[in-house]
Amino acid sequence: CKAMHVAQPAVVLASSRGIASFVCEYASPGKATEVRVTVLRQADSQVTEVCAATYMMGNELTFLDDSICTGTSSGNQVNLTIQGLRAMDTGLYICKVELMYPPPYYLGIGNGTQIYVIDPEPCPDSDF
């Protein structure tokens, strides 16, 4: 297993609709034809997998059914979007990239993106 540098933004603020997007960029040492991207969430020293996708030559990442993630790829960049976030989902979201093929296998883990989610205030009742 060889190490690889992965860069991602330090902080992202989710939209009022609970959507957060960020770019995960990896320094590929060669021409990988099969790449696996995993988003991990770290909170209170617990790490859980949020979503994962393996992609090849296309630009659309396909996630498992009911995933809260969507994404596209362009070169060595992966544009990730996480949906349905609430305040309790605030935490550090880490991008893990694996170059699955051809050998050698490379693994890179980013420093994480702190995603802040603020639940919208409920609209006050109006007299209309």
Epitope: E34, G58, E60, T62, T72, Y101
Partner: antibody
Framework: QVHLQQSGDVLVKPGASVNLSCKAS?????SYWINWIKQRPGQGLEW???????????YYNEMFTGKATLTVVTSSTTAYIHLNSLSFEDSAVYFC????????WDQGTTLTVSS | QIVLTQSPAIMSASPGGKVTITCSAS?????IHWFQQKPGTSPKLLIY???TLASGVPARFSGSGSGPSYSLTISRVEAEDAATYYC?????????FGGGTKLEVR
């Protein structure tokens, strides 16, 4: 040029198993998914699953879990689908298609399950 | 799984006319892709990533849409366009196709 060539049409009895092949040429085999698609007579398209030829990574439509198994032999740039415990509902045309974009398809293999 | 609903299921058009086929997803998808299938042949990639024409596809074909709602338009129908058209999503597994729209050119 890119070409996908599938095995010939097949007639089998219920309960039997079958292997269909998809021979790829004209491109780097390990750089693209191979997808398998089922089409029953007069019906639409159903995605069975896909395999990454380099690593062997597979994704299946749950509807075909236990029914279909995807494999590849990279040395011969050939992908295979194994269909087991065949029933009349498995009678269909089976296609293989290349890549994320399904940009090249083979001509299809007609599988007929009949007693 | 994401269900793609195409409408209409069958339609008829005259040469030179304009037709629009819609594809509605049960939940938002990143892109929709379109395929054309003529009787007895394999499907052919027509449009990918919602609006990009595949190689060799005439400019009379166009695609548009976002979120859960997409469409395929043929601006000036020709006799050779008689076929069944399928939309497809690749946002989540399993990959799914719409039920198809059969276009008859009279």
């Amino acid at each position: 040029q890119v070409h996908l060539q599938q095995s010939g049409d097949v007639l089998v009895k219920p309960g039997a198993s079958v292997n269909l092949s998809c021979k790829a040429s004209g491109y780097t085999f390990t750089s693209y998914w191979i997808n398998w698609i089922k089409q029953r007579p007069g019906q639409g398209l159903e995605w069975i699953g896909r395999i990454a030829p380099g690593s062997g990574t597979t994704y299946y439509n749950e509807m075909f879990t236990g029914k279909a198994t995807l494999t590849v032999v990279t040395s011969s740039t050939t992908a295979y689908i194994h269909l087991n415990s065949l029933s009349f509902e498995d009678s269909a045309v089976y296609f293989c298609a290349r890549g994320d974009y399904f940009d090249y398809w083979d001509q299809g293999t007609t599988l007929t399950v009949s007693s | 799984q994401i269900v793609l609903t195409q409408s209409p299921a069958i339609m008829s058009a005259s040469p030179g006319g304009k037709v629009t086929i819609t594809c509605s997803a049960s939940k938002s998808v990143s892109y929709i892709h379109w395929f054309q299938q003529k009787p007895g042949t394999s499907p052919k990639l027509l449009i990918y990533d919602t609006s990009t024409l595949a190689s060799g596809v005439p400019a009379r074909f166009s695609g548009s849409g976002s979120g859960p709602s997409y469409s395929l338009t043929i601006s000036r129908v020709e006799a050779e366009d008689a076929a069944t058209y399928y939309c497809q999503q690749r946002t989540t597994y399993p990959l799914t196709f719409g039920g198809g729209t059969k276009l008859e050119v009279r």
